[in-house]
Amino acid sequence: SSPCPQAWGPPGVQYGQPGRSVKLCCPGVTAGDPVSWFRDGEPKLLQGPDSGLGHELVLAQADSTDEGTYICQTLDGALGGTVTLQLGYPPARPVVSCQAADYENFSCTWSPSQISGLPTRYLTSYRKKTVLGADSQRRSPSTGPWPCPQDPLGAARCVVHGAEFWSQYRINVTEVNPLGASTRLLDVSLQSILRPDPPQGLRVESVPGYPRRLHASWTYPASWRRQPHFLLKFRLQYRPAQHPAWSTVEPIGLEEVITDAVAGLPHAVRVSARDFLDAGTWSAWSPEAWGTPSTGPLQDEIPDWSQGHGQQLEAVVAQEDSPAPARPSLQPDPRPLDHRDPLEQHHHHHHHH
C-alpha cells in the first residue's frame, strides 16, 4: 500500500502552500525507502537517495516555479511514481447568506471569502435550534442535523424545505479543500429573512368616464402558497410619464383605484408585497405596467375620503374577508446592539441583499 495519504482531490496530485515548506511523497514505494527525485523531463537530480528523507522530497519555501510534475525512482532505477504539485491556500470561512420567498422554505447561498486556488467543495447542513430547560433534558426533540441539499447544477446554493416559520435554524457551510476545512455558521429564522417574490400579473386599465382614475390589479406571486394565517399586504406606486416622484398607497386586497391620475398622461404603476404581519422585508417591485386614464365622456367625480390616496373597490374587501390571523405578533430580534466582532478572530464583509 502507498505511504502517501490521498488528499481530497484528483489522484496523483499533492498540495502545498506558497512560502511554506512542502513535502512530496513517492507513492509507489514502501515508507522510508530511499528514492531519487527529478522534475519531469529534466535530467538534474533534485534529491538523492542518501538525503535521509526516505520516500519524501522536501521543498523549502515553495513558490509557483515549484508547481509541476515530479518523478521518483527507486535505488534500482525503477519508477516509484509521478507526483504533480499544486500550490494554494487552506480554506477560509465562506460568506453565507440565506433568503426565503415564502413562509415554509428557504435557501442559502455561499461564496469563498478568499480564493484558495485549489479544488474546493462545500458541505452544507442545518439544524433546528432549541434552548432546553433543565426539566426538559430528558427528552430532546429531533433537531437534526440534516443535510441541506445542494442545487444539482453546481450553483452555490442549498434549499431547506418544510421549515417552521417560528423556529430558528443554524446553517453550517464548510469549505473543504486538500489543505483543510473551514466552517461558517449562520443562524436564520424565516420570519427575519422572508422576502416575497414580487406580485405578478399587474394590469393597469382606464375607468371609462373617469379621466382621473386608473384601475390596477395583480395576483399573489406564484411562489406564495396562500393560507389564512400567511397573507400578503401590498404597496403600490404610480407616477405620470416623465414625472420623477412616485406616489405610494397601501391597497387592501389585490386591486386599487387611483383617483388622482393626471388626465391624458400615461402612468407607470408597480407593486410590492410583504407578509401582512410585517415579517421580513418588502419584495422587489414588480415590473412596471402602464395605463392612461380614459378620455371618454366625463362623469361627475364624487369627492372621495382618500383625497387622492386611492380608493379600494368594495368587491376587494369582500374578496379578502378572512378569519382573524391566528399568528402571534413578531418577537423583537435578540441580536447584538452594536457592530463589534465577538467570538471570531476573522472578519468578513457581509453583502446585504
Epitope: 460568506v95 453565507v96 447568506s97 439544524r127 435550534k129 432549541t130 434552548v131 432546553l132 430547560g133 433543565a134 433534558q137 430532546s140 433537531t143 437534526g144 442535523p145 443554524r170 453550517n172 473551514s182 466552517t183 455558521l185 449562520l186 443562524d187 430580534d333 435578540p334 441580536r335 447584538p336 446592539l337 452594536d338 463589534r340 466582532d341 465577538p342 467570538l343 471570531e344 478572530q345 472578519h347 468578513h348 464583509h349 457581509h350
Partner: antibody
C-alpha cells in the same frame, strides 16, 4: 437523554497541573458551543472558558488566561480543560456547560448555558 | 471582566413577587441582548431560567420573566413558591475576549 458528565477533578499541589474532561451524550456535540464555569466554595459562579463548535475559536476569563487551555474532540464528544500553574484560588467545583450561541453573518456570540454537568471538584492545596 | 452587580439578597412571602436587578455596562448588559438568568439550589448545578433577556426555555414556568433597560437587566419571580428559595445569577456576553460574565448572585428567601 441530554447529558454532560465531568471527570478529572481532584487534589493537586500549587503549581501543579490537571486535565478535566466532559463527556457529552444525547445531542450532536459538534454543533454546539461549550464552556467551563467554576464556583469556589461558598462563592458565586465564575465564567472560565468557551469554545466554538469546530474548536477554531476560544475565549478565557482574565483570571485563567495563559494557564488554562480549552479544547474539544468532536469525534469523541468530549470537552477538555487543561489547567497548569494551579493556584489556591483555582479551588472550585468546575462545571461543563452547553450553549446554543448565536451566529450572525460575521460573528458568533455567547448566549446562554442551557445544559450543565453535575460538576467536578478541584482542590489546590499543599 | 468585572462581575455584574446584583443585590446580595431579596425576599418575599408566598404568592408575592420579587424582582432582582443586574447592573453592568454598555460593554456587556447594555451592548447586547444576550442576558440570561440562572437558578441554583444548594449543592446542585445551575438551571437556565431566562435567555436573550426575555425568553424562557421549555419547561420553565411563566412566573419567571426577564426585562432590560439600558445597562440593567431584571428578573421578576411572581407568585413566589417555597421551591423558589435559591441563589439567582445573571449572565451576559461580555464583549471582549470571547467572554461571558456572571453576576455576583442574589439569595432569594421565601418568608413564612
Amino acid at each position: 437523554e441530554v447529558q454532560l458528565l465531568e471527570s478529572g477533578g481532584g487534589l493537586v499541589q500549587p503549581g501543579g497541573s490537571l486535565r478535566l474532561s466532559c463527556a457529552a451524550s444525547g445531542f450532536t456535540f459538534s454543533w454546539y458551543f461549550m464552556g467551563w464555569v467554576r464556583q469556589a466554595p461558598g462563592k458565586g459562579l465564575e465564567w472560565v472558558s468557551y469554545i466554538y463548535p469546530s474548536g477554531g475559536s476560544t475565549g478565557y476569563a482574565d483570571s485563567v488566561k495563559g494557564r488554562f487551555t480549552i479544547s474539544r474532540d468532536n469525534s469523541k464528544n468530549t470537552l477538555y480543560l487543561q489547567m497548569h500553574s494551579l493556584r489556591a484560588e483555582d479551588t472550585a467545583v468546575y462545571y461543563c456547560a452547553r450553549d446554543e450561541g448565536y451566529c450572525s453573518s460575521t460573528s458568533c456570540y455567547f448566549d446562554a448555558f442551557d445544559i450543565w454537568g453535575q460538576g467536578t471538584m478541584v482542590t489546590v492545596s499543599s | 471582566q468585572s462581575a455584574l452587580t446584583q443585590p446580595p439578597s431579596a425576599s418575599g412571602s408566598p404568592g408575592q413577587s420579587v424582582a432582582i436587578s443586574c447592573t453592568g455596562t454598555s460593554s456587556d448588559v447594555g451592548g447586547y441582548n444576550f442576558v440570561s438568568w440562572y437558578q441554583q439550589h444548594p449543592g446542585k448545578a445551575p438551571k437556565l431560567l431566562i435567555y436573550e433577556v426575555t425568553k424562557r426555555p421549555s419547561g420553565v414556568p411563566d412566573r419567571f420573566s426577564g426585562s432590560k433597560a439600558g445597562n440593567t437587566a431584571s428578573l421578576t419571580v411572581s407568585g413566589l413558591q417555597a421551591e423558589d428559595e435559591a441563589d439567582y445569577y445573571c449572565s451576559s456576553y461580555g464583549g471582549s475576549n470571547n467572554a461571558g460574565v456572571f453576576g455576583t448572585g442574589t439569595k432569594v428567601t421565601v418568608l413564612g
